[in-house]
């Protein structure tokens, strides 16, 4: 059962796993949710009746029954983890805590103009978990405007104390706001020879990399595969760090793989969701339950629905035994990973999918697409929406992309002459315009947010957000697309598609069926040569064939330029402008979304 509200002046008795320090009960709940075993917590707020050394303690708890006895205690705030809930979860915490000093290892001290600048510094520093900033009113003159960057083993403060005229806060890496590089490559036959901060068992290097990503201290990792010569180290995932933030030594070793934490790409690739099945593999751990199941998929479902289950092993049924049902072993451990991994016993193992809700919805794999052809199939571009105007008549106005459950990203130039959001309707999950009838459900638009530097499409800033009146329930036919990570600026996208209901040539009609075209990206230098009379800025991105023939056109505006990278689709561009349509040596010009990620997050995450 999902319980989101906090219980004031209430303490849960027993079930303690560990104690951490958090600046608020709300953040304690987030820490509990991300902890592999925590189901409940008790937080102690500051209070004259409470010993100051206990202020800000967040006691993480577990219980076989998923609940614990309640005791009345002033200043105690208790609650449940969000593990039991089905909604999206985020560790992003933008709150600034006034007059609180969050203790940790102070490894960097510098002058900053504001707490915001200090927070940005922390976000862009590979080691930083949180910061404390001494304001200009701080009593000690030499400490005024000092920004202390801090880290700890757990990522949470080792203590929190009251201190006048300071403010503290967390790194915004988990809000996708870091400018740090996003290195997705996994290096085969490589060992990073740096200090280990932890080790866990993992079935493959991808899981190892994802574990590294959500481990607070891990910056890179080395994984020993099941063919690794030393038997005791097979399937071992070593979580590592270094002072520089990069591996100091790389050793060539066969059957080992190494890679980096995906902290700076976590909003555009899954880091919590281990959805694969591992055949002929047994995961060992504390047994939670043994249940009969028809298949390993059914076993995974059972594990996902059992809130304490972290991973499972399924042993298929012996012929004609137990109505063809096999045994499903639901398991857990102290850190969420198997205590040992064995091969050759015929089991099929995997992980709970409960943690998938901690990943951005946009990373979910979508239907395989039909290659070739110009008409799309249903569910092929589930983030594509058709934006309709109802004035003077109801018709398709522009394309757009779902980027959040209340947000559509589109082009600013679509709203020329649109005086009110009331005349707009957003239709999602649409393949054919002819499907849109009087009773077709749509999303009303609450607000149109146009970039305040926008003047005209050709001069840039052609970007707008639509805030919907109601939230989008994600399904196979309507779900978000990932924004590119700022750390991905140097990625060369090779699989890019433009989609829309727009014209197929300069004089044409809105298409009934959603059209698609694969289009190569063009460098800005090349694009500038083709548009001598315009300034192609770094905030624009171009795409097109030298010979022309495929391009976006009238009616496609605001729609996505979607590029697939590492099996995840990213919204690389917004259809903006061009000279004619599909003309030779006249590429289409798109708004370069990566350059507006901060703007998008600022507008969509504003309270």
């Amino acid at each position: 059962e999902c319980v989101t509200q906090l219980l004031k002046d209430t303490c849960f008795e027993g079930g303690d796993i560990t104690t951490v320090f958090t600046p608020s009960a709300k953040y304690c709940q987030v820490v509990c949710t991300y902890h592999p075993r925590c189901l409940l917590f008790t937080f102690t707020a500051e209070s004259p009746s409470e010993d100051p050394t206990r202020w800000f303690t967040c006691v993480l708890k577990d219980s076989v029954t998923e609940t614990l006895p309640r005791v009345n205690r002033t200043a105690a705030i208790s609650g449940y983890s969000f593990k039991q809930c089905s909604h999206q979860i985020s560790a992003c915490n933008k709150d600034i805590y006034v007059d609180l000093d969050m203790k940790g290892i102070n490894y960097n001290s510098s002058v900053a103009k504001s707490a915001q600048e200090c927070q940005e510094r922390c976000t862009d520093d590979v080691h930083c978990h949180f910061f404390t900033y001494a304001t200009r009113q701080f009593p000690s003159l030499e400490h005024r405007n000092i920004c202390l960057l801090k880290h700890t083993q757990t990522g949470t403060p080792t203590r929190i104390t009251k201190l006048d005229k300071v403010v503290s806060g967390f790194s915004l890496k988990s809000c996708a706001l870091s400018n740090l590089a996003c290195i997705r490559d996994i290096f085969p036959n490589t060992v990073f020879a740096d200090s280990n901060i932890d080790s866990v068992m993992a079935p493959d290097a991808f899981v190892c990399g994802r574990i590294c990503t959500h481990h607070p201290g891990c910056l890179f990792f080395t994984f020993f595969s099941q063919e690794w010569p030393k038997e005791s180290q097979r399937n071992l995932c070593l979580l590592k760090t270094s002072e520089s933030g990069l591996p100091s030594t790389r050793i060539k070793k066969s059957k080992a793989l190494s890679g980096f934490s995906l902290q700076s790409c976590r909003h555009s690739i899954p880091v919590f969701c281990h959805s694969s099945f591992y055949h002929d593999t047994d995961f060992l751990g504390e047994e939670l339950d043994i249940v009969a199941a028809k298949s390993h998929e059914a076993c995974q479902k059972l594990c996902t629905n059992a809130v304490r289950c972290q991973f499972f092993t399924y042993t298929p049924a012996q012929a004609s035994c137990n109505e063809g049902k096999g045994k499903c072993y639901l398991k857990l451990s102290s850190n969420g990973s198997p205590t040992k991994i064995l091969h050759g016993r015929g089991g099929i193992s995997g992980y709970t999918l409960r943690l998938c809700k901690m990943d951005n919805e946009c990373t979910t794999k979508i239907k395989p697409r039909i290659v070739g052809g110009t008409a799309s199939v249903r569910g092929e571009w589930p983030w594509q929406v058709t934006l309709h105007t109802t004035s003077p008549t109801q018709r398709h106005l522009c394309g757009g992309s779902i980027i959040g459950n209340q947000w559509i990203l589109t082009a600013a130039h679509c709203f020329y002459g649109v005086e009110s959001p009331k005349i707009l309707r957003v239709y999602s999950g649409i393949l054919n315009q002819s499907e849109i009838k009087e009773d077709t459900s749509f999303f009303g638009v609450q607000e149109i947010i146009i970039h305040d530097q926008y003047k005209m499409a050709e001069s840039g800033y052609d970007i707008a957000l639509l805030k919907l009146e109601t939230t989008v329930n994600y399904t196979d036919s309507q779900r978000p697309i990932c924004l590119p990570s700022k750390g991905d600026r140097n990625v060369i996208y090779t699989d890019c598609w433009v989609t829309g209901w727009g014209y197929r040539k300069l004089r044409d009609k809105i298409q009934n069926t959603l059209q698609k075209a694969k289009i190569p990206l063009v460098t800005n230098e090349e694009c500038q040569k083709r548009y001598r009379g315009h300034k192609i800025t770094h905030k624009m991105i171009c795409a097109g064939y030298r010979e022309g023939g495929k391009d976006a056109c009238k009616g496609d505006s605001g729609g996505p330029l979607s590029c697939k990278h590492n099996e995840v689709w990213h919204l690389v561009g917004i259809t903006s402008w061009g000279e004619g349509c599909a003309q030779r040596e006249r590429p289409g010009v798109y708004t370069n979304v990566v350059e507006y990620v901060d703007w998008i997050l600022e507008k969509t995450q504003a309270v």
């Epitope: 109802t390 008549t393 018709r395 849109i436 009087e438 004089r507 009609k509 009934n512």
Partner: antibody, heavy 121, light 113 residues
């Protein structure tokens, strides 16, 4: 079931006026663009005029522009065509028609039974 | 303003297939959607094809529409011809660069033999 019922047709002298009405039922009238299409005896179809949902925008064929006025009353789910300065070439059966909900193209999804207008001295 | 030209009459025998063409005089046939209407004597028209090739749910799948850019014309095809298909058929399109200006073809009388 969509129903469009025209009325108001009849015999009228050239230069005089006539007002046609079309009462709609079976759909949300205020959500649709409506039109009049006419058909001269033993001749083809000819679009006359269209009006958007709230009546704020009207469209006419050139030969009736300035003589005909299209209006609607959404509360009464009724479409009107006020025809002034009638000419003999306006003689036709006048059909009330409903455009599609989504105007990504222009066509006539539903038609009424028609009302005959005869302009003759 | 363009015109849409249809043959005055077309005939076909019972259970055969017929095609009625509709040629656009200027501008590309593909620049705007073509619709088709069936009209029995003394009855109002019925929309049988819209948006080039889309069929309303209540219309028989024996009716299909297409456009051919090489001949700059649209076509209505009726397969497995029935006696009740005998009627006048009108094509209709518009100029997509002008707000509202539907244009009808002159109509084709279909006789079922």
């Amino acid at each position: 079931e969509v129903q469009l019922v025209e009325s108001g047709g009849g015999l009228v002298q050239p230069g005089r006026s006539l007002r046609l009405s079309c009462t709609a039922s079976g759909f949300t009238f205020s959500k649709y663009v409506m039109a009049w299409v006419r058909q001269a005896p033993t001749k083809g179809l000819e679009w006359v005029a269209s009006i958007n949902y709230d009546g704020s925008t009207t469209y006419y064929r050139d030969s009736v522009q300035g003589r005909f006025t299209l209006s609607r009353d959404n509360a009464k789910t009724t479409l009107y065509l006020q025809m002034d300065s009638l000419r003999s070439e306006d003689t036709a059966t006048y059909y009330c028609a409903r455009h599609p909900f989504n105007n990504f193209g222009i066509w006539f999804a539903y038609w009424g039974q028609g009302t005959l207008v005869t302009v003759s001295s | 303003q363009f015109t849409l030209t249809q043959p005055k009459s077309v005939s076909g025998s019972l259970r055969s297939t017929i095609t009625i063409p509709c040629e656009r005089s200027s501008g590309d046939i593909g620049d705007s959607y073509v619709s088709w209407y069936q009209q029995h004597l003394g009855r109002p028209p019925i929309n049988v094809i819209y948006a080039d090739d889309q069929r309303p749910s209540e219309v028989s799948d024996r009716f299909s529409g297409s456009i051919d850019t090489s001949s700059n014309s649209a076509s209505l095809t009726i397969t497995n011809l029935q006696m009740d298909d005998a009627a006048d058929y009108f094509c209709q399109s518009y100029d997509s660069n002008i707000d509202f200006n539907p244009v009808f073809g002159g109509g084709t009388k279909l006789t079922v033999l």
